[in-house]
């Protein structure tokens, strides 16, 4: 199995390090680790450490993805893992660049129908439930690279081949150019650049900022939609409350989004999804008689 493959390759990571829960000593402080007579000092960050079984999980996800997406079976998952590892291992986790991820981006190159892209902000689960039913539409996490990294955390250390399972830089408290943030910025930019025709975005109507300029959607994807390819951005504002009949398309932050998009010579439209549960049900069974009314 996959564990044997890693064992055979002697991939180096902090064995048992998940059990060493050091207290945080402030941003980027140094703490001793190891029980040898000579203390080994290592960086301590404010964010959670690398997800346990990170190498095995990435490799397993890659193999699974190629199994269920036959068009991607040309991908060599060992090379993908090597490229992923190469992007952050032995590098300072606050000094990661998009360039570091280029070998991985190249290996993970994938053609998705450019007019079937669904972006999302702060409402990932519903977006994924939707593309699970509407199989011809794709979120970033439906692509190989997004699928590999979804919900994972990772970082290394400068000048050692170790993976840091204790802590990784937090975007706010430590630094923004950390391995996870730079990865998502890179793949999100490429995903948005690939989009064409009508692009959909699912937004969370329950949040105080329905459109947040500081989200990945607001700071990366919006600005990388290509006006010469994208005709319209259509926002779907998802309502949280059962009795919420307000037109959230009139929300000031949605107006702000419309302004940004219009200035980029892309048309903007907005729809309220008042009943997300019914919305999904109607995507599954469009012939249902209750699906003709507004959702």
């Amino acid at each position: 199995g996959l564990n044997d493959i890693f064992e055979a390759q002697k991939i180096e990571w902090h064995e048992g390090s998940h059990h060493h829960h050091h207290h945080h000593h402030g941003s980027g402080s140094l703490v001793p680790r190891g029980s040898g007579s000579v203390p080994r000092w290592r960086q301590q960050w404010s964010g959670p450490g690398t997800t346990k079984r990170f190498p095995e999980t990435v490799l397993a996800r890659c193999v699974k993805y190629t199994e269920i997406h036959p068009e991607m079976r040309h991908v060599d998952c060992q090379s993908v893992w090597d490229a992923f590892k190469g992007a952050f291992i032995s590098k300072h986790p606050c000094n990661i660049t998009e360039e570091d991820y280029q070998p991985l981006m190249k290996l993970g190159t994938q053609t998705v129908p450019c007019n079937k892209i669904l972006l999302w902000s702060r409402i990932k689960d519903l977006a994924h439930q939707f593309t699970q039913v509407q199989r011809d539409m794709f979120t970033l996490e439906d692509t190989l690279l997004g699928y590999l990294a979804d919900d994972l955390t990772w970082c290394g250390e400068f000048n050692t081949s170790k993976i840091n399972y204790q802590s990784c830089p937090d975007w706010r408290k430590d630094c923004s150019n950390n391995p996870v943030s730079v990865f998502w910025k890179t793949v999100s930019r490429r995903f948005a650049e690939a989009a064409c025709d009508v692009v959909h975005v699912m937004l969370n109507g329950s949040r105080s900022k329905i459109f947040d300029k500081n989200s990945t959607f607001g700071s990366v994807e919006v600005h990388n939609l290509q006006p010469e390819k994208v005709q319209t951005l259509e926002a779907w504002v998802i309502h949280g409350g059962r009795e919420d009949s307000r037109d959230l398309c009139q929300d000031p932050t949605i107006k702000e989004l419309e302004s940004i998009i219009s200035k980029r010579n892309i048309q903007f439209s907005c729809k309220n999804i008042y009943r997300p549960d019914k919305f999904l049900q109607c995507v599954k069974n469009p012939e249902d008689s209750s699906c003709t009314s507004e959702i």
Epitope: L2, I5, P70, Q78, H128, Q132
Partner: antibody, heavy 123, light 112 residues
């Protein structure tokens, strides 16, 4: 050692539902896709669908989209198939199955199979 | 969907002789990665199917070297050299080039 242990035989009334299980052991459950296959009495094999236990995502053969629902419980490393609106056509043995990984590549063949669960639809 | 068509065997096959089972696919099963996604299974009476061959010609772990697979993009053969009593059962070919994976109708092997 990889093992897929399926639940015992089921008898279902026409129009009712049955849910059968496949408990995985000997490997990390979330690292592999689980497939389901149907074999009607004296007949060949038909692929029903797959589930990715890690994400809960699924895909189905067209003819099983309204018939079968695949789920997985990662805490018990168990995959399930629920068959709804039972008819005599659903009388069959149902297998769960999994591929092998050959040096970081999915072999494309079902190397591991459960022992099968016979579902009989009878009034 | 890709249609898999299996040929019949002249039954029963004398013990110790070779048997060849054929299978045809409605489309080429050769992937751009160079692999041909054709599998062979044996289902012994009362048992689950057992993977014999994957990628058209690669024997699965623990499978006797009496079993060999060959073919081109659409025409495939499973050869059993020196059939034995334990080889009795139904042999299925299966394509896994695309979804849904589809199986042949099966070829029954009986031994004289």
């Amino acid at each position: 050692e990889v093992q897929l242990q399926q639940s015992g035989p089921e008898v279902g009334r026409p129009g009712s539902s049955v849910k059968i299980s496949c408990k995985a052991s000997g490997y990390i459950f979330t690292d592999y896709i689980m497939h389901w296959v149907k074999q009607s009495p004296g007949q060949g094999l038909e692929w029903i669908g797959w589930i990715d236990p890690e994400y809960g995502s699924t895909d189905y053969a067209e003819k099983f989209k309204k018939k079968a629902t695949l789920t997985a419980d990662t805490s018990s490393s168990t995959a399930y198939i629920q068959l709804s609106s039972l008819t005599s056509e659903d009388t069959a043995t149902y297998f769960c199955a999994r591929v092998a990984i050959i040096t970081t590549v999915a072999s494309g063949g079902f190397a591991y199979w459960g022992q099968g669960t016979l579902v009989t639809v009878s009034s | 969907d890709i249609v898999m068509t299996q040929g019949a065997l002249p039954n029963p096959v004398p013990s110790g002789e070779s048997a060849s089972i054929t299978c045809q696919s409605s489309e080429s099963l050769l992937h751009s990665n160079g692999k041909t996604y054709l599998n062979w299974y044996l289902q012994r009476p009362g048992q689950s199917p057992q993977l014999l061959i994957y990628w058209m010609s690669t024997r699965a772990a623990g499978v006797s070297d009496r079993f060999s697979g060959s073919g081109s993009g659409t025409d495939f053969t499973l050869t059993i050299s020196g059939v034995e009593a334990e080889d009795v059962g139904v042999y299925y070919c299966q394509q896994f080039l695309e979804y849904p994976p589809t199986f042949g109708s099966g070829t029954k092997l009986e031994i004289k």
